[in-house]
Interface confidence: low
C-alpha cells in the first residue's frame, strides 16, 4: 500500500480541513511555547506544500517522509533555541531520531498561563467575526496544554465547541445556554486527555505488548459475542491507531482510526450488537461513540474456563507452542466472563496464570502443578473488591470534599516529597471516584473505579517523571503498570520524611479569597491542608480537621467583613498561633 | 472481516463416513490452532478435536477418538475432519472455531446419521 506521496495520500484522505487542523495539532503538541501565529503561518506552508503534492506526486520533496516535512518545518522556527533551549538540539538529528527527540520534549506541565474563560459577549463577537481563526485557536490552545491529547478525538470535540456557539450565540440567554455546554466540554477534554495519557504512557513505558494485552481484555468486555481472531484483528488495528497517535503521526492516527471505525461498522454482525446507533453517525461521532459504547450481553452457556485452561492435559503444549496467543486467548475468555472485573484486574489474574505456567510447565508434573491456580485468583479478585466498598462508605458518609480531604491527607503521608499543586491536583482527582463510580450496582463498580484510579495514578506518575523526588512514587510508578494501584494503597506513612519548615506566608490570605468560585476557594483550603500534613506529618485527623473547620469559619468570617483584607491580616495571625497550637508546631 | 465456512455435511447411514472443510479467511490462519465444535439438537456445545497451528499436534475427545481426524492445509486455509464409522450419537451440527473456544462463530454444517 506504498504511495508515491504520504503527504498527498492523507491530504487526499483526510481532506484540507482536516489535515490543516491535525497539523496544527501535531505542531503545538510539539513546539508547546510557539504563538498561535507562528504555528498558523507555519501550518498554511505545509498546506500549499500538499496540494501542489496532490497536483504532482512527483513534485521536488513530495516523496520525503511526514516526520521529515513537519521536522524541517519546525526547525525552521527562528526562536527555537530561546524559547525552548537543549530541544534547538533535536534539529541537529536525523530520522527517525529528530522526532524521537521533540517527543522526549513534551511537557506534561508546561509552563503556560491559565486559561481564561472571557464574557459570554465577547466569545461571540470574536466567534462571528472569524470562526475559523476561533476554532483554531481552541485546537491549538487544548493541544500545547495537552501534548498528548487523542488528535482525532480533539477533532470531534472541536465540532462540538463550533456547535455550542453555533446554537448559543444566538439565543436569548446566550450565557445559560452557552456555559454549562463548555463546562461541560472541558471537564470531558480533561478526562479524554487522561485516558489518551495512560494509553502512551503503557505504550511508551511498557511497550506494544502491555498496550494490546490491555487492549485484548478491554474489548473482550466491551465484545463478547466476537470471536477470539475477530477481537485479535482490533486489537492489532487499534494498537497501531494509538501507536501512531503517541508517535506524534497524528495524519497517519485519524486516517487509520476512520479505516478502524469503518471496518467496525461494516463487520458489526460479528463483533457486537451495541453498534447499531453508532454506525448511523457521522465520521468523528461514530468513532467517538463506538470508543464509549457499552458492554455487549455476554453469550449464553460459556463453558467453564477450567477445561481448556487447567483440566486439559495439553496446557504446556499449548502454551509453549505460541505463548503470547495462548495467554491472549485466555485473557479473552477471562474478560468476556467477567465485565464485573477492572482491567487491571483481569491483567493481573492473566499475569498470574503465565508466571503459574511458566514455573508448572518445566516442573516433573504440570499439571498438579497447576490444578490449582483458579484458587491464587480469589485473593486478587477480594483485594479491589474489599478496597472499594471501604472508600465507597467513606464517601458516601463525607461528601467528595471532605473525601477528597482524607485522601489529600491520606496521599500526603504516603508521598510528602510531592510538590502541593500535583498532591491536590491528584488527590482531588482520585476523590472524585466516589460521585463518579460509588452510584453504580455492584456489578460495575470495579471496572469504574479501579480503571479510572488507574488513569488518575498516572497523572501523578507522569508529572513526577518530570521532576522525581520520590523514590516511592518512582518504584510504584516503573515496576508494574497493572500494580500501580495496589503499590500506591501498600504505602504507609513515609517514615523517612523530614517534616518541612513552618512558614507562616503559606498560611497567609488575603480578602481575594471571597470573590473566587467554590472549586477555587476548595483548592486554595485543601492547599493549606496538603501544608499542614507536611509540616506535621504525625497530625491526628481529629487535629486536621479542628484546625481546617477553624480555617473554614475565618474564611467565611472574614468575607463577610466590612473591612476584609485587615479581618484576613488580624484574623489570620490569631489563626495560625491557633493552628501552631493546636499541632504542636 | 474473519470468516469461517463449514462444508461437506450431510445424511449418512450409521458406520458411513463424511469430510467437512472449513474455508477461513479474514485473519492469520497459519498462526492459530483451531477446533472443532459440535451442537446436537437441545445440547450444549461439545469440544470434538483441535490442531495446533502447524498441524502437528491433534486432540480428540475420548467419544471420537479413533474414528475421527484432524487435519489442515494453511495454504489453502482450510480446516478438515475426517469422520469415519459415524454413530447416530454423531448427529449434530459441527462447526470449526479458532483456538479452544466453543463458542460459535459460524453457521456450522449439518450431520445427520442415521440407524
Known amino acids: 500500500d506504498a504511495h508515491k506521496s504520504e503527504v498527498a495520500h492523507r491530504f487526499k484522505d483526510l481532506g484540507e480541513e482536516n489535515f490543516k487542523a491535525l497539523v496544527l495539532i501535531a505542531f503545538a503538541q510539539y513546539l508547546q511555547q510557539c504563538p498561535f501565529e507562528d504555528h498558523v503561518k507555519l501550518v498554511n506552508e505545509v498546506t500549499e506544500f500538499a496540494k501542489t503534492c496532490v497536483a504532482d506526486e512527483s513534485a521536488e520533496n513530495c516523496d520525503k517522509s511526514l516526520h521529515t516535512l513537519f521536522g524541517d518545518k519546525l526547525c525552521t522556527v527562528a526562536t527555537l533555541r530561546e524559547t525552548y533551549g537543549e530541544m534547538a538540539d533535536c534539529c541537529a538529528k536525523q530520522e527517525p531520531e529528530r522526532n524521537e527527540c521533540f517527543l522526549q520534549h513534551k511537557d506534561d506541565n508546561p509552563n503556560l498561563p491559565r486559561l481564561v474563560r472571557p464574557e459570554v459577549d465577547v466569545m461571540c463577537t470574536a466567534f462571528h467575526d472569524n470562526e475559523e481563526t476561533f476554532l483554531k485557536k481552541y485546537l491549538y490552545e487544548i493541544a500545547r496544554r495537552h501534548p498528548y491529547f487523542y488528535a482525532p478525538e480533539l477533532l470531534f470535540f472541536a465540532k462540538r465547541y463550533k456547535a455550542a456557539f453555533t446554537e448559543c450565540c444566538q439565543a436569548a440567554d446566550k450565557a445559560a445556554c452557552l456555559l454549562p455546554k463548555l463546562d461541560e466540554l472541558r471537564d470531558e477534554g480533561k478526562a479524554s486527555s487522561a485516558k489518551q495519557r495512560l494509553k502512551c504512557a503503557s505504550l511508551q513505558k511498557f511497550g506494544e505488548r502491555a498496550f494490546k494485552a490491555w487492549a485484548v481484555a478491554r474489548l473482550s468486555q466491551r465484545f463478547p459475542k466476537a470471536e477470539f481472531a475477530e477481537v485479535s484483528k482490533l486489537v492489532t488495528d487499534l494498537t497501531k491507531v494509538h501507536t501512531e497517535c503517541c508517535h506524534g503521526d497524528l495524519l497517519e492516527c485519524a486516517d487509520d482510526r476512520a479505516d478502524l471505525a469503518k471496518y467496525i461498522c461494516e463487520n458489526q454482525d460479528s463483533i457486537s450488537s451495541k453498534l447499531k446507533e453508532c454506525c448511523e453517525k457521522p465520521l468523528l461521532e461514530k468513532s467517538h461513540c463506538i470508543a464509549e459504547v457499552e458492554n455487549d450481553e455476554m453469550p449464553a452457556d460459556l463453558p467453564s474456563l477450567a477445561a481448556d485452561f487447567v483440566e486439559s492435559k495439553d496446557v504446556c503444549k499449548n502454551y509453549a507452542e505460541a505463548k503470547d496467543v495462548f495467554l491472549g486467548m485466555f485473557l479473552y475468555e477471562y474478560a468476556r466472563r467477567h465485565p464485573d472485573y477492572s482491567v487491571v484486574l483481569l491483567l493481573r489474574l492473566a499475569k498470574t496464570y503465565e508466571t503459574t505456567l511458566e514455573k508448572c510447565c518445566a516442573a516433573a508434573d504440570p499439571h498438579e502443578c497447576y490444578a490449582k491456580v483458579f484458587d491464587e485468583f480469589k485473593p486478587l479478585v477480594e483485594e479491589p473488591q474489599n478496597l472499594i466498598k471501604q472508600n465507597c462508605e467513606l464517601f458516601e458518609q463525607l461528601g467528595e470534599y471532605k473525601f477528597q480531604n482524607a485522601l489529600l491527607v491520606r496521599y500526603t503521608k504516603k508521598v510528602p516529597q510531592v510538590s502541593t499543586p500535583t498532591l491536590v491536583e491528584v488527590s482531588r482527582n482520585l476523590g472524585k471516584v466516589g460521585s463518579k463510580c460509588c452510584k453504580h450496582p455492584e456489578a460495575k463498580r470495579m471496572p469504574c473505579a479501579e480503571d479510572y484510579l488507574s488513569v488518575v495514578l498516572n497523572q501523578l506518575c507522569v508529572l513526577h517523571e518530570k521532576t522525581p523526588v520520590s523514590d516511592r512514587v518512582t518504584k510504584c510508578c516503573t515496576e508494574s503498570l497493572v500494580n500501580r494501584r495496589p503499590c500506591f494503597s501498600a504505602l504507609e506513612v513515609d517514615e523517612t520524611y523530614v517534616p518541612k519548615e513552618f512558614n507562616a506566608e503559606t498560611f497567609t490570605f488575603h480578602a481575594d479569597i471571597c470573590t473566587l468560585s467554590e472549586k477555587e476557594r476548595q483548592i486554595k483550603k485543601q492547599t493549606a491542608l496538603v501544608e499542614l500534613v507536611k509540616h506535621k506529618p504525625k497530625a491526628t485527623k481529629e487535629q486536621l480537621k479542628a484546625v481546617m473547620d477553624d480555617f473554614a469559619a475565618f474564611v467565611e468570617k472574614c468575607c463577610k467583613a466590612d473591612d476584609k483584607e485587615t479581618c484576613f491580616a488580624e484574623e489570620g495571625k490569631k489563626l495560625v498561633a491557633a493552628s501552631q497550637a493546636a499541632l504542636g508546631l | 472481516e474473519v470468516q469461517l465456512v463449514e462444508s461437506g455435511g450431510g445424511l449418512v447411514q450409521s458406520g458411513g463416513s463424511l469430510r467437512l472443510s472449513c474455508a477461513a479467511s479474514?485473519?492469520?490462519?497459519?498462526?492459530?490452532?483451531m477446533s472443532w465444535v459440535r451442537q446436537a439438537p437441545g445440547k450444549g456445545p461439545e469440544w470434538v478435536s483441535a490442531?495446533?497451528?502447524?498441524?502437528?499436534?491433534?486432540r480428540y475427545a475420548e467419544s471420537v477418538k479413533g474414528r475421527f481426524t484432524i487435519s489442515r492445509d494453511n495454504a489453502k486455509k482450510t480446516l478438515y475432519l475426517q469422520m469415519n464409522s459415524l454413530k447416530p450419537e454423531d448427529t449434530a451440527v459441527y462447526y470449526c472455531?479458532?483456538?479452544?473456544?466453543?463458542?460459535?462463530g459460524s453457521q456450522g454444517t449439518q450431520v445427520t446419521v442415521s440407524s
Open positions: 472455531t479458532i483456538g479452544q473456544s466453543t463458542t460459535r
Open positions: 479474514g485473519f492469520t490462519f497459519g498462526s492459530f490452532g
Open positions: 490442531v495446533d497451528s502447524g498441524g502437528a499436534d491433534t
